[in-house]
């Protein structure tokens, strides 16, 4: 995300179109309190950050309240009055959607439909991952609404599920982040379970003739 400008690496995350977090890693200024200055309009004066993130006692980032802002963030990271990194970027392309809420499971024989509340903005993928203790890795299915039907499940097996939301790269570009995963929930025979057995009984070996 942030190439080096005077050795400064930056990362921007826009949490659910609510809060922007800009962090920096500047080896050249590792013992320095760099300051963060920003504006949402190219014609305004810069404001200084009022909510710094600290690492080992020095500034390492800034949190900005940016509820539903879809404009350009102009910012400057400074060592005193000297800018060490200056840029202006569309914030929406650093989107990290919120974790899926109100996740529900609707079972019908060998299939389950996973639903959750759709987020208010578009061009998202809702991804469900699932596995049984017999699976070596997670299986995945995704749709562009939070209504994902997974078929061909074995009603006798216990399955773990979790859900996340991703911005479509084709539309949002390469700098977005998937949401955090929802909590894992476990199901067997259409009923919720506390957990699925981690180590299933291994299949009996076939006797060679």
């Amino acid at each position: 995300q942030g190439g080096a400008a005077e050795g400064v690496q930056i990362q921007i995350i826009y949490f659910n179109l609510e809060t922007v977090q800009v962090t920096w890693n500047a080896s050249k200024y590792s013992r320095t309190n760099l300051t963060f200055h920003y504006r949402f309009n190219g014609d305004e004066a810069y404001d200084q950050c009022t909510n710094y993130l600290l690492q080992e006692g020095h500034t390492s980032g800034c949190l900005l309240d940016a509820e539903q802002r879809d404009d350009i963030l102009y910012f400057s990271i400074r060592n005193g009055t000297h800018p060490v990194f200056t840029a202006s970027r569309w914030m929406v392309y650093y989107l990290k959607p919120s974790s899926p809420k109100h996740v529900r499971f609707s079972w019908h024989q060998d299939a389950v439909t996973v639903t959750c509340s759709d987020l208010s903005y578009g061009d998202l993928l809702y991804e469900v991952q699932y596995r049984s203790p017999f699976d070596t890795e997670w299986q995945s299915k995704q749709e562009n609404t939070c209504n994902v039907t997974i078929e061909g499940l074995d009603a006798e097996k216990c399955y773990s599920f979790w859900v996340r939301v991703k911005a479509m790269e084709d539309v949002y570009g390469p700098d977005t982040y998937p949401s955090d995963w929802s909590e894992v929930t476990c199901w067997q025979r259409g009923e919720i379970r506390d957990a699925c057995a981690e180590t299933p009984t291994p299949p009996k070996p076939k006797l060679s003739k």
């Epitope: 190439g3 350009i72 102009y74 840029a87 970027r89 569309w90 392309y93 539309v171």
Partner: antibody, heavy 117, light 107 residues
Framework: EVQLVESGGGLVQSGGSLRFSCAAS????????MNWVRQVPGKGLEWVSS????????YYADFVKGRFTISRDNSKNTLYLQMNSLRAEDTAVYYC??????????WGQGTLVTVSS | DIQLTQSPSFLSASVGDRVTITCRAS??????LAWYQQKPGKAPKLLIY???TLQSGVPSRFSGSGSGTEFTLTISSLQPEDFATYYC?????????FGQGTKVDIK
């Protein structure tokens, strides 16, 4: 599939006005910034204007400030450029473009605006 | 505003040649640089974004490199369909700006 289709270019007298549009499909139009870029015949590409997804923030190149207005109608998935006080040097092909912070992948086919003096 | 200077402005080459185009920025732009190909009467086509990432569907003979102020577009083996004009664009800071273009012509 994302598509951008411009319409409304044409011949206009110097000092006159023209509005043209860009119809978008294949993505959630209201969630994304949009851009206008122009190209004078035989010359290079030149950014003209950008607008935020909601339409609440607009940005202009210095050479069009006060003369051009970018706008959008999210209910119609359409982007507009209103051009006033046109000059001969505004003669160009105008493109709408959609991208992200790293590059603009989607472009309209372009619409030619000719300003006669 | 950030100025981008492309060199050369004009380049004559033959099919099979290795071609390199340079784009220099007047100040650091991290890796926020894109490369476009444009043919007469057509809209620009995105080839490379984020300085070095190949856009899907673009042949692998195209590659981009660089960071900060100096960037290059390389065509490893020029094909007949590659004769066109190429532009760099910076998106690090508004306003976005383009290089003046490099026309690649048949020798």
């Amino acid at each position: 599939e994302v598509q951008l289709v411009e319409s409304g270019g044409g011949l206009v007298q110097s000092g006159g006005s023209l509005r043209f549009s860009c119809a978008a499909s294949g993505f959630t139009f209201s969630s994304h910034p949009m851009n206008w870029v122009r190209q004078v015949p035989g010359k290079g590409l030149e950014w003209v204007s950008s607008i935020s997804g909601s339409g609440g923030s607009t940005y202009y190149a210095d050479f069009v400030k006060g003369r051009f207005t970018i706008s959008r109608d999210n209910s119609k998935n359409t982007l507009y450029l209103q051009m006033n006080s046109l000059r001969a040097e505004d003669t160009a092909v105008y493109y709408c473009a959609k991208g992200h912070n790293s590059g603009w992948k989607y472009w309209g086919q372009g619409t030619l605006v000719t300003v006669s003096s | 505003d950030i100025q981008l200077t492309q060199s050369p402005s004009f380049l004559s080459a033959s099919v099979g040649d290795r071609v390199t185009i340079t784009c220099r920025a007047s100040q650091g732009i991290s890796s926020y640089l894109a490369w476009y190909q444009q043919k007469p009467g057509k809209a620009p086509k995105l080839l490379i974004y984020a300085a070095s990432t190949l856009q899907s569907g673009v042949p692998s003979r195209f590659s981009g490199s660089g960071s900060g102020t100096e960037f290059t577009l390389t065509i490893s083996s020029l094909q007949p369909e590659d004769f066109a004009t190429y532009y760099c664009q910076q998106l690090n800071s508004y306003p976005p700006t383009f290089g003046q273009g490099t026309k690649v012509d048949i020798k």
